[in-house]
């Protein structure tokens, strides 16, 4: 999906109002310095591409993030403010269903959500030069 035509300001507002709080809740008890940010993005569409990938695509050691509250609200925001987004997700969801077993918070998931927090922070500061 090409995120170029999304309403970035509305997605940002939803992130600041609620998604960010759900990410913090997920990470509660984890030190903010515990994980190094290794995933980056260069502009808002690129950030949303990376956010979608980390949130909804199962990875080795963390197959369960798509069932978390922040993921549900992220999906809602993208579907509402990115034209045509919900129509592109059918195949992705089928793959997700096969990969998902149970909701277990592993250290790998905590690391992945830490990366997500970094991507969202970058999304909110689009004018900053890439480090």
């Amino acid at each position: 999906y090409d995120f170029t035509n999304c309403d970035f300001e509305k997605i940002k507002a939803a992130y600041l109002s609620t998604i960010s709080k759900d990410l913090i809740t997920y990470m509660s008890g984890t030190k903010s310095t515990e994980f190094n940010n290794t995933v980056s993005c260069s502009n808002r569409p690129h950030c949303l591409t990376e956010i979608q990938s980390l949130t909804f695509n199962p990875t080795a050691g963390c197959a369960s993030l798509a069932k978390e509250m922040f993921a549900m609200k992220t999906k809602a925001a993208l579907a509402i403010w990115c034209p045509g987004y919900s129509e592109t997700q059918i195949n992705a969801t089928q793959a997700m269903k096969k990969a998902r077993k149970s909701k277990v918070t592993t250290n790998k998931c905590l690391e992945q959500v830490s990366q997500l927090q970094g991507l969202w922070r970058r999304f909110n500061r689009p004018l900053l030069k890439q480090q």
């Epitope: 509305k10 507002a13 939803a14 600041l16 109002s17 609620t18 709080k21 759900d22 913090i24 809740t25 798509a66 069932k67 509250m69 549900m72 609200k73 999906k75 809602a76 925001a77 579907a79 509402i80 987004y85 919900s86 129509e87 997700q89 059918i90 992705a92 969801t93 997700m96 269903k97």
Partner: antibody
Framework: QVQLQQSGAELVRPGSSVKISCKAS????????MNWVKQRPGQGLEWIGQ????????NYNGKFKGKATLTADKSSSTAYMQLSSLTSEDSAVYFC??????????????WGQGTSVTVSS | EIVLTQSPALMAASPGEKVTITCSVS???????LHWYQQKSETSPKPWIY???TLASGVPVRFSGSGSGTSYSLTISSMEAEDAATYYC?????????FGAGTKLELK
Amino acid sequence: QVQLQQSGAELVRPGSSVKISCKASGYAFSSYWMNWVKQRPGQGLEWIGQIFPGDGETNYNGKFKGKATLTADKSSSTAYMQLSSLTSEDSAVYFCARGGYVNFLYAMDYWGQGTSVTVSS
Amino acid sequence: EIVLTQSPALMAASPGEKVTITCSVSSSISSSNLHWYQQKSETSPKPWIYGTSTLASGVPVRFSGSGSGTSYSLTISSMEAEDAATYYCQQWSSYPLTFGAGTKLELK
């Protein structure tokens, strides 16, 4: 304007199944989570689960897994909930409610009028 | 599962009286995830207060909401007849979504 129109009251036999519907209009049906909520007579509200019509993803309250099955038909903008192996405990009013951002806060912002299900022999 | 405990379960207030309904949450949640709904008999619930303190469209300004962490409240500054209803708090912080048992507010 957003509207959620639910199917009519049902009187069903114990052990049978029932499928109730919620027809949405006034918004992009595929892009919003649809929730289902149970209310027994004189009791409070209980969340059953939700479905994302765009791809059929569901989240259930563990208490209702095996009891409720949520589906959605994008072509008719209608969400469905099937209740199986009905007992008197399933006699209740069932509401559909859209999940949406209001002032960028996420909540159930529009509700159907409710469908009464009575289980009786 | 997050448990929401409302108090009182039932109360009666005279016109003009100040009313406060509380919602205690079993584990701390963000204020953005605590909502209130109003339900009158035989009708569907209506969104009443979003994210602890934002009034839904059409809700009179005599209503207000506050709180954080595990303690939230809905306040009516001056009770009116049309405020008689059942009020439910609800959390959208973690699955399963849960509601308080409700507070039935009657007119004295």
